[in-house]
Amino acid sequence: NKGTDDATADSRKTYTLTDYLKNTYRLKLYSLRWISDHEYLYKQENNILVFNAEYGNSSVFLENSTFDEFGHSINDYSISPDGQFILLEYNYVKQWRHSYTASYDIYDLNKRQLITEERIPNNTQWVTWSPVGHKLAYVWNNDIYVKIEPNLPSYRITWTGKEDIIYNGITDWVYEEEVFSAYSALWWSPNGTFLAYAQFNDTEVPLIEYSFYSDESLQYPKTVRVPYPKAGAVNPTVKFFVVNTDSLSSVTNATSIQITAPASMLIGDHYLCDVTWATQERISLQWLRRIQNYSVMDICDYDESSGRWNCLVARQHIEMSTTGWVGRFRPSEPHFTLDGNSFYKIISNEEGYRHICYFQIDKKDCTFITKGTWEVIGIEALTSDYLYYISNEYKGMPGGRNLYKIQLSDYTKVTCLSCELNPERCQYYSVSFSKEAKYYQLRCSGPGLPLYTLHSSVNDKGLRVLEDNSALDKMLQNVQMPSKKLDFIILNETKFWYQMILPPHFDKSKKYPLLLDVYAGPCSQKADTVFRLNWATYLASTENIIVASFDGRGSGYQGDKIMHAINRRLGTFEVEDQIEAARQFSKMGFVDNKRIAIWGWSYGGYVTSMVLGSGSGVFKCGIAVAPVSRWEYYDSVYTERYMGLPTPEDNLDHYRNSTVMSRAENFKQVEYLLIHGTADDNVHFQQSAQISKALVDVGVDFQAMWYTDEDHGIASSTAHQHIYTHMSHFIKQCFSLP
């Protein structure tokens, strides 16, 4: 920043609440879509351009005037893998986090006209092109359909779909939110011959019911009913099928071949948790027991002579955890070699760090190809010579991310491709590879302004800068911006990382109010090297508040010793560690220990509430947005992963003594703002309603705000502005700021 170290002499404006709410300073992205190994699409002034990766030259793929007469606002587009058709999405209606319905039309790029015959129906739930060519699979009214050609009639694959009961090719609420992080439960084979799909049965799953108030003119509120399994409740069941799309005909029903779960899963409740095609005729399925410390991978081959799928027991791979649960949130996906006879997978090693292991399908044991007191975040690409991965190894910073390549013929030959490119500005990378990994886009998201660059895998040469946010940089030169500090403290001989957003002209000899921004859920990370323009930027820049975050026990990417510390004990160590962090920050000399606040959303709202209800005396006030209050109220898949079952034989005692309500009395010592959306399908309004009731019952005065018809994100334009304005007032009042 230009200007002076002296705050009084700095005449530049600060980053205001309005700047945040109106998004005055916009980070520019460079969102590309690879369409081959050397070409990508990029949208510029609503024209779709096709770029040559090697030379950087571009041509217009589709002019912005093409759909002037279309008559609908296009929400998204998707080009068929053979480049012959474009799928246009409109009439978008959001459902849950990932799910939505929409209308679709198909435009023939050769004929330069919309296809008017055999159109996809309105209110379609999911559509996807086959990986090659231009077949389409879609889900409508919970049933699956396939189009061999965009202008041909659809072949109906399933006939059992029923709203809120049977879901074919799409996920129910809990699978969408907690297992697949997607609405889709369809998986094309690499050449588009086979279509695999899951079927979920929610017949016995209890319904969550809540009012939706809608327009003022609605005399009686609508009741929304969603099959939602809470901890210990009846779960959905799952079946898995594969259909050969070459067999489809209008005059006979499609034959779907079922692949059943392994015997070790069928003995009790279980989940399907990963589907990965290994080759054209080999598929891997991962299954997980309801008690999520035991998973099995099946590898199944197509038998052409019988038309069935065979999963040999000798090829099963078991993954289990003795200290917690399998995977970070679920078992990681396998990355198969071209022949499908081996794969690479991120699993926990003996020391409890997540690293890449090399498996051969017919052998039980695997060979770790990475090791160290750091973790592999993700496998990004696999070629015949190299495996590319992102890790947080560099400089021992768990909150950093860099791209590495490892030579498959010699695992000792590891190269960091991003570490030294721009080490001051860029310490947190993600990557997007071309179809065969000949080129890659590096996306640096901090600590400096985001930077997007293109590279060649042949020599790892940087080809060009795609976006450097120089315009934003110039604008921010005229703003008093906060600085970000990323460091660690040592507790019980263990490093715990924190970040602080420090006010402009930060002076360690002065005393600042501190707001602890908390999430603290299992495998979370709030201390990182990412550049953000958010509410904290305003609080630090304009209100001179330090906004800190701390990754304590339970946090991720630092080994299972830290992450699994809270196994079966949510609401304990991760809560205590936030309190201890605040104490440590108080000792640093620049924190006004009479003005320490805490806030969080979702799991962060739970931890905030548990901290405020702890009676620690450290915090003056806090804000909980959409908090969990009792784990029996939250969904089965997430909750039971960490807590087991709420039964006397399992972990009922800790379910009962980890509630916010049981701490109600201690809220007399703090100022509390409780906020929730009434239409929260995820963390139900029930959770805050029960906190409110408990506080009222013991005579606690507190502040509360509900957001009518808002879901877990409270993201509508008006509600978003209202909540942050409201929270700002609360924090300023708490800190006695003008």
Partner: antibody
Framework: EVQLVESGAGVKQPGGTLRLTCTAS????????VHWVRQAPGKGLEWVGV???????DYDAAFMSRVTISKDTSKSTVYLQMNSLRAEDTAVYYC??????????WGQGTTVTVSS | DILMTQSPSSLSASPGDRVTISCRAS??????LNWYQQKPGQAPRLLIY???NLQTGVPARFSGSGSGTDFTLTISRLEPEDFAAYYC?????????FGSGTKVEIK
Amino acid sequence: EVQLVESGAGVKQPGGTLRLTCTASGFSLTTYGVHWVRQAPGKGLEWVGVIWGDGRTDYDAAFMSRVTISKDTSKSTVYLQMNSLRAEDTAVYYCMRNRHDWFDYWGQGTTVTVSS
Amino acid sequence: DILMTQSPSSLSASPGDRVTISCRASQDIRNNLNWYQQKPGQAPRLLIYYSSNLQTGVPARFSGSGSGTDFTLTISRLEPEDFAAYYCQQSIKLPLTFGSGTKVEIK
């Protein structure tokens, strides 16, 4: 390369049985259905029946009682058996591959004559 | 059963002529109609599937149109090798049925 070859041609006795073989190559009988169609001398095409990839069969009602279509996937062969032959069963019999809703490959045909 | 009626049953034409053959279904078959060509002593060959889609390798002078109950096969410029019998076939419902055929002869 996809090919279908019919065999079993010849002169059959009225009241007798014919068994035609269709040998397929270049595709899997567990994926694609195989149909039989016949064509009487100087006449049009008449659908007889089909065996689908999963082994299910469908027949024209006119042949239901006396026709059986079967297959041996290990030998890549499809069979058409017709009982109680009569003179009007004299025809060229074709087998064809089912590609979705059309017949994309046909055999060359095999001639069956029913005569005493 | 769905009855397929083809007309004319035969026609005479010269090379270079434009020829249209009609096929009518006894009920709505949407676009589920295919056209086949059969030369003497040979098996039929697929020309058009699903009313208007040209099978790979078939010359562009062949085209199909129609939906519901009325369909047309058009040969824009007749070539000597096009003299043959032509059959329509519905594929929407079992039993599958063919038209009785149209024989295109040299004038």
